[in-house]
Amino acid sequence: FERTRSLQDPCSNCPAGTFCDNNRNQICSPCPPNSFSSAGGQRTCDICRQCKGVFRTRKECSSTSNAECDCTPGFHCLGAGCSMCEQDCKQGQELTKKGCKDCCFGTFNDQKRGICRPWTNCSLDGKSVLVNGTKERDVVCGPSPADLSPGASSVTPPAPAREPGHSPQ
């Protein structure tokens, strides 16, 4: 099959790092400077990505693979392949159109990115608040209020055993 395919399409023999050059009777030519082809059989080489401005180079371009970018300090990547850089905020803040804003009361953000999220509602799980939440940290839920009442035991005693053939008095 490979041989049949190569006879039909000479470009299929061109390896990564080359392109099938129509100007040279479809012979394989190495990619020109600052371009790449990451797979075989390509008819063109792609221009290398340039990591400029707020982007910085994480991996240099080669003739067989594109450059990879990340973001300069104070920014973080968004999108596939770090297509965008977004400004970091402090913990306890979120990024809005007007810049970094503190989380509203009842919400928190423990990262430098993302949005403020509501504190956990401990009562929904029948628990009480053990440690209060802050702008940077979620609340810590503890045992349920009933478990903390005086005289309450966390161990339920076993039910008394019944003797067979006796009805309860």
């Epitope: 990619c31 371009c61 003739s63």
Partner: nanobody, 111 residues
């Protein structure tokens, strides 16, 4: 423009070795994509080995493990060391840089 002249071809038995040279004159040598091609009678010219623009050596499947491309920037010379030669390596071998081609050097593998 760049001028290229190959040498080192000849007649060799199967399993033998040859070292081809390509003398480069003209433009800056060290930064160029430099390649070795070959063309067997009645066949299309094929890429054998090359230095990419990132200065990494690459080889066609037919050359891997047997051929080695190298360069001497001070001598402005590109080399192709060919070991374990086979009958199917018989071809005219060409040096290439961009649009510039050498006249070629004949390599014949025959018993």
């Amino acid at each position: 423009a760049v001028q290229l002249v190959e040498s080192g071809g000849g007649l060799v038995q199967p399993g033998g070795s040859l070292r081809l040279s390509c003398a480069v004159s003209g433009n800056i040598f060290s930064i160029r994509v430099m390649s070795w091609y070959r063309q067997a009678p009645g066949k299309q010219r094929e890429l054998v080995a090359w230095f990419a623009w990132d200065n990494i050596a690459h080889y066609a499947d037919s050359a891997k493990g047997r051929f080695t491309i190298s360069r001497d920037n001070t001598k402005k010379t590109l080399y192709l060391q060919m070991n374990s030669l086979k009958l199917e390596d018989t071809a005219v071998y060409y040096c290439n840089s961009g649009d510039s081609w050498g006249p070629g050097t004949q390599v014949t593998v025959s018993s």
